[in-house]
Interface confidence: low
């Protein structure tokens, strides 16, 4: 089959990298600078991403493969492939209508993109509050009292606090 | 905000203006630099987010620079010519949602 | 260079009418809808009116309406009163996330 297309389509025999050149009777020739073509038998090259502004190159193009961008320190990508970057707030913040603002009492968001997520409910799983929760960190859940006879563990468990997971702040 | 700084100065010379936030955290909004010369319409200079990165337009790139401390976020221009005499805006917010408060500006004049 | 252009301008209207002012882009602005409308009056700094192509700003009047996608914007202002006299700017946030602002419209009564 192989055989057989190559001969009614020359432009199969292109490798990825080049081009079926119909200007030059389908000689296969290399990509232009700043164009690859990453599968063979293709009659044009396609343009290679540009990288520019917010937008970073993480992996340059070659004459086979596209450039690949990240986003520039202060943003995150958004989209497939990072179509889109954008701006970062800090860890204990999220990104609203009116800029950047604190987690409220009771979320967290340990990245600096993304919205605040609540606390985990210890007692939910019938457990204690290890460590008291932040605007940057989930609360960490211990076992519960009941699990901590004596000599079981040398940790020795926080007074609980007055709603589970909360801290003051 | 109020911007500040603005004055009569030489060609060549350099100025810094600042920016005094009041009443907000800088710690959560983008700050942005704007002008308009006499007559003309608003200009992007470019901004400062959150984290301290900052990003110019293409052609203020080099002679301008923006920078933050607590409260103030400085402007600073090198090599003034006349096309910089112009109102400074100084405005909050990001890209995102716009610019939703601005300073009543500062004038810079370039003149020898 | 990404352009915004404006039209018309300056625009003339009469009290209680509307006028609507458009704004296209020589490429589509980020994620289609980075765009912004501002209203500016001589002697004093721009004023937020719409972000994101069609979202109001708070204590903005209902009266102003953004609308459009990718490279064609429109703000429209219905019910014109006198203190609308202004300059209006369209502000576009592009793929490189560099900022341009329109060359400017000036609505004016008759």
């Known amino acids: 089959f192989e055989r057989t297309r190559s001969l009614q389509d020359p432009c199969s025999n292109c490798p990825a990298g080049t081009f079926c050149d119909n200007n030059r009777n389908q000689i296969c020739s290399p990509c232009p600078p700043n164009s690859f073509s990453s599968a063979g038998g293709q009659r044009t090259c396609d343009i290679c991403r540009q990288c520019k502004g917010v937008f970073r190159t993480r992996k340059e193009c070659s004459s086979t493969s596209n450039a690949e961008c990240d986003c520039t320190p202060g943003f995150h990508c958004l989209g497939a492939g990072c179509s889109m970057c954008e701006q970062d707030c800090k860890q204990g913040q999220e990104l609203t209508k009116k800029g950047c603002k604190d987690c409220c009492f009771g979320t967290f968001n340990d990245q600096k993109r993304g919205i605040c997520r609540p606390w985990t409910n210890c007692s939910l799983d019938g457990k204690s509050v290890l460590v008291n929760g932040t605007k940057e960190r989930d609360v960490v859940c211990g076992p519960s009292p009941a699990d901590l006879s004596p000599g079981a563990s040398s940790v020795t468990p926080p007074a609980p606090a007055r709603e589970p997971g909360h801290s003051p702040q | 905000v109020e911007e500040s700084g603005g004055r009569l100065v030489k060609p060549d010379e350099s100025l810094t203006l600042t920016c005094t936030a009041s009443?907000?955290?800088?710690?959560?909004?983008?700050m942005t630099w704007v002008r308009q010369a006499p007559g003309k319409g608003l200009e992007y200079i470019g901004f400062?987010?959150?984290?301290?990165d900052t990003s110019y337009a293409s052609w203020s790139k080099g002679r301008f620079t923006i920078s933050k401390a607590s409260t103030t976020v400085d402007l600073k221009i090198s090599s003034l010519t006349t096309e910089d005499t112009a109102t400074y805006f100084c405005g909050r917010g990001g890209l995102t949602f716009g610019w939703d408060l601005w300073g009543p500006g500062t004038l810079v004049t370039v003149s020898s | 260079a990404q352009v915004l252009t404006q039209t018309p301008s300056p625009v003339s209207a009469a009290v209680g009418g509307t006028v609507t002012i458009n704004c296209q882009s020589s490429?589509?602005?980020?994620?289609?809808?980075?765009l912004s409308w501002y209203q500016q009056k001589p002697g004093q700094p721009p004023k937020r009116l719409i972000y994101?192509?069609?979202d109001l700003a708070s204590g903005v009047p209902s009266r102003f309406k953004g609308s459009g996608s990718g490279t064609q914007f429109t703000l429209t202002i219905s019910d014109l009163e006198c203190d609308d006299a202004a300059t209006y700017y369209c502000a576009g946030v592009y793929s490189d996330n560099t900022y341009v602002f329109g060359g400017g419209t000036e609505v004016e009564f008759k």
């Open positions: 400062i987010n959150v984290g301290g």
């Open positions: 490429q589509s602005v980020y994620s289609n809808s980075f």
């Open positions: 994101s192509a069609s």
């Open positions: 009443g907000f955290s800088l710690s959560h909004y983008w």
